[in-house]
């Protein structure tokens, strides 16, 4: 006899990285017929929704109108059908960004390189932080973590045309509080013509969408949870 229901999906819209004082919605998708959803924050009950009519609703949304460091952390949700509760969802790490300062991102030997060259990114931030994150804009969550007193280096090794794209970095004050993003650095990797034309390149978002941090996923992927890329989420753990 089944003791628990399948775990729900949890995600954040527009993104799990939220600039401070901006809004975010935490979505929890369970099953049609669920009479109650609970959102938990850092292990404690945060909010409750009892959708009506339950048989017509399989997703609830928890709205955070004003993101701040108190609201950043790990969220999970559960739902109930009758008296039977679900397994808890995976943990959603909600990150507040635009805290304190802006790091500087540079690349060596430069932003235009030849396929096979060794490339290293440097992220520098003079305020008190020792953890840095390098993100590549695009469809997947290409995130690297680096450490250093005021600067971290991110060696990409010998690059291919797949490394082409726009990069930014953050200083991290803790796992869930990040700095402003650095200015973007666009890496251009040239190779022979056949390689270049066939190289897969992550679609990059226009600069003005960065403000909403739609940098690591397309809306379609975000809605199709089976395809949701958890690289960045897992990295936070």
């Amino acid at each position: 006899q089944q003791q628990t229901l399948p775990k729900p999906f949890i995600w954040a819209e527009p993104h799990f990285m939220v600039p401070k004082e901006k809004q975010v919605t935490i979505c929890c998708q369970g099953n049609y017929g669920a009479v109650e959803y609970q959102l938990h924050f850092e292990g404690s009950l945060f909010a409750v929704d009892r959708p009506k009519p339950p048989e017509r609703i399989n997703k609830v949304q928890f709205y955070i109108p004003d993101m701040n460091s108190r609201m950043a952390g790990q969220y999970s949700c559960i739902y109930r059908v009758g008296e039977l509760w679900s397994e808890p969802s995976n943990l959603l790490d909600l990150v507040v960004t635009e805290m304190y300062d802006t790091p500087t991102l540079s690349v060596h030997p430069g932003p235009e390189v030849i396929s096979g060259e060794k490339v290293t990114f440097y992220c520098r931030l003079d305020t008190a932080t020792s953890m840095f994150l390098l993100l590549k804009e695009g469809r997947s969550s290409h995130v690297q973590r680096g450490y250093g007193k005021v600067q971290a280096e991110f060696p990409l090794g010998p690059v291919t045309t797949a490394h082409r794209g726009t990069y930014r970095c953050f200083g991290s004050y803790n796992n869930h509080a990040w700095s402003f993003p650095s200015e973007p650095v666009k890496l251009l990797v040239t190779g022979d013509i056949e390689n270049t034309s066939l190289a897969p390149e992550d679609p990059t978002f226009p600069a003005d969408t960065w403000g909403t941090y739609l940098l690591t996923t397309e809306t379609g992927l975000q809605k199709d949870h089976a395809l949701w890329d958890h690289t960045a989420q897992n990295l936070l753990r």
């Epitope: 919605t25 924050f41 404690s44 009950l45 945060f46 909010a47 409750v48 929704d49 009892r50 959708p51 009506k52 609830v60 949304q61 928890f62 709205y63 109108p65 004003d66 108190r70 609201m71």
Partner: nanobody, 127 residues
Framework: QVQLVESGGGLVQPGGSLRLACAAS????????MGWFRQAPGKEREFVAA????????YYADSVKGRFTISRDNAKNTVYLQMNSLKPEDTAVYYC????????????????????WGQGTLVTVSS
């Protein structure tokens, strides 16, 4: 933006009853979910009860379940907390809070969920 003013606190004997009221300013009261919290001297603020914006969902702390009832009158821009069978451990300053969820059926349990707060009203349960 909504302003909240609590009333109805006072001194009551154990086993007695009190009804707290929280009046909200503005014409958008029905778009807010409401909650009651309390803070006893030297303790952290704790959740008591909450009600969704249409009144269809209520939620209570285990410590008050069966004794306290939360209700609202959207025509009067007021939320109520009926407190029966009061105990000395119910002594605290009671705060009303409001927030705007995306659904009619949602309530907040954590204080961080709420955007707006009243100044509080003192309830003392003592013989």
């Amino acid at each position: 933006q909504v302003q909240l003013v609590e009333s109805g606190g006072g001194l009551v004997q154990p086993g007695g009853s009190l009804r707290l009221a929280c009046a909200a300013s503005g014409r958008t009261f029905s778009t807010y979910a409401m909650g009651w919290f309390r803070q006893a001297p030297g303790k952290e603020r704790e959740f008591v009860a909450a009600i969704s914006r249409n009144g269809g969902t209520t939620y209570y702390a285990d410590s008050v379940k069966g004794r306290f009832t939360i209700s609202r009158d959207n025509a009067k821009n007021t939320v109520y907390l009926q407190m029966n069978s009061l105990k000395p451990e119910d002594t605290a300053v009671y705060y009303c809070a409001a927030s705007r969820p995306l659904s009619n059926t949602q309530v907040g349990v954590a204080s961080a969920w709420y955007e707006f707060w009243g100044q509080g009203t003192l309830v003392t349960v003592s013989s």
